[in-house]
Amino acid sequence: TPGPVRRSTSPPVALRELIEELSNITQDQKTSLCNSSMVWSVDLTAGGFCAALESLTNISSCNAIHRTQRILNGLCNQKASDVASSPPDTKIEVAQFISKLLNYSKQLFRYGH
């Protein structure tokens, strides 16, 4: 299970760190990310970072997204049972999910910064 982001990281800083990490992942894709594993295409607008974390938690052996998982763990301040959103019915490749999560994160950052 990914460990928590260091306690001193405030939400705006953690969000910026997430954007940096996701940008690095999207730019560094020389080979298929996480062996083209598939994850649930969750509704980020409804479920936020907790839904993203839940979706990515199903991938256990991909070093490339470990830091993303750790940052998401720090940004998600709900228990798993509190995440109330309709269950997804579509799976997408991790690379596509990361791109979607990056766009969502940047939008949040620009609105809230």
Partner: antibody
């Protein structure tokens, strides 16, 4: 080629509203990740950031001037407009618009600037 | 707001000299530091973004370094066309803020 061009009244009377227009060439504010900032520079002094607007109409202002500033865009004309109300002689400055891009990291770096338009506030 | 302090406010150096300009932020800006060059009567131009990334078309004699609150712009070999005022700007936190500028002159 990316260029920006500011236009303004040149001279404004105190208490009036200053309206500045920035016309964009070589890029469109309807394109994802594009943004435009306004910055001003009083004669012989440094730079002060005023406001910016993103392609999806997210707007941010300098809190010191927020109550007097309004930024908007007209995508069809590829223009960004800045309004500054209740002007005072201390608002005399060269006003610049500049492009910022949020692809990848959001650096808030202004990569292309207009030539600037000098605005004098005087009765 | 984050305060940006540049030093020196002005300097005079000879052609070929190595020139360094310092910029200090009032708090950690996590490398979100940009440098601009402004020649008399002209608009500023982006030189370096995110501490050390050279903007396209900028000569390689310009470089940037630093972290946390302290950053430096270096001109490895000053050229006559480098006469200008240089500004740092933090992009970590809104409102965006600029340093007071460093005027570079040729001896």
């Amino acid at each position: 080629e990316v260029t920006l061009r500011e236009s303004g009244p040149g001279l404004v009377k105190p208490t009036q509203t200053l309206t500045l227009t920035c016309t964009l060439y070589g890029f469109s504010l309807s394109t994802s990740d594009m943004g435009v900032d306004w910055i001003r520079q009083p004669p012989g002094k440094g730079l002060e950031w005023l406001a910016h607007i993103w392609w999806d109409d997210v707007k941010r202002y300098n809190p010191a001037l927020k109550s007097r500033l309004t930024i908007s865009k007209d995508t069809s004309k590829n223009q960004v407009v800045l309004k500054l109300t209740s002007v005072d002689p201390v608002d005399t400055a060269t006003y610049y618009c500049a492009r910022t891009v949020s692809s990848g990291y959001i650096y808030y770096a202004m990569d292309y600037w207009g030539q600037g338009t000098l605005v004098t506030v005087s009765s | 707001d984050i305060q940006m302090t540049q030093s020196p406010s002005s300097l005079s150096a000879s052609v070929g000299d190595r020139v360094t300009i310092s910029c200090r932020a009032s708090q950690d800006i996590r490398n979100y530091l940009n440098w601009y060059q402004q020649k008399p009567g002209k608009a500023p131009k982006l030189l370096i973004f995110y501490t050390s990334k050279l903007h396209s078309g900028v000569p390689s004699r310009f470089s940037g370094s630093g972290s946390g609150t302290d950053y430096t712009l270096t001109i490895s070999s000053l050229q006559p066309e480098d006469i200008a005022t240089y500004y740092c700007q933090q992009g970590n936190t809104l409102p965006l803020t600029f340093g007071g500028g460093t005027k570079v002159e040729i001896k």
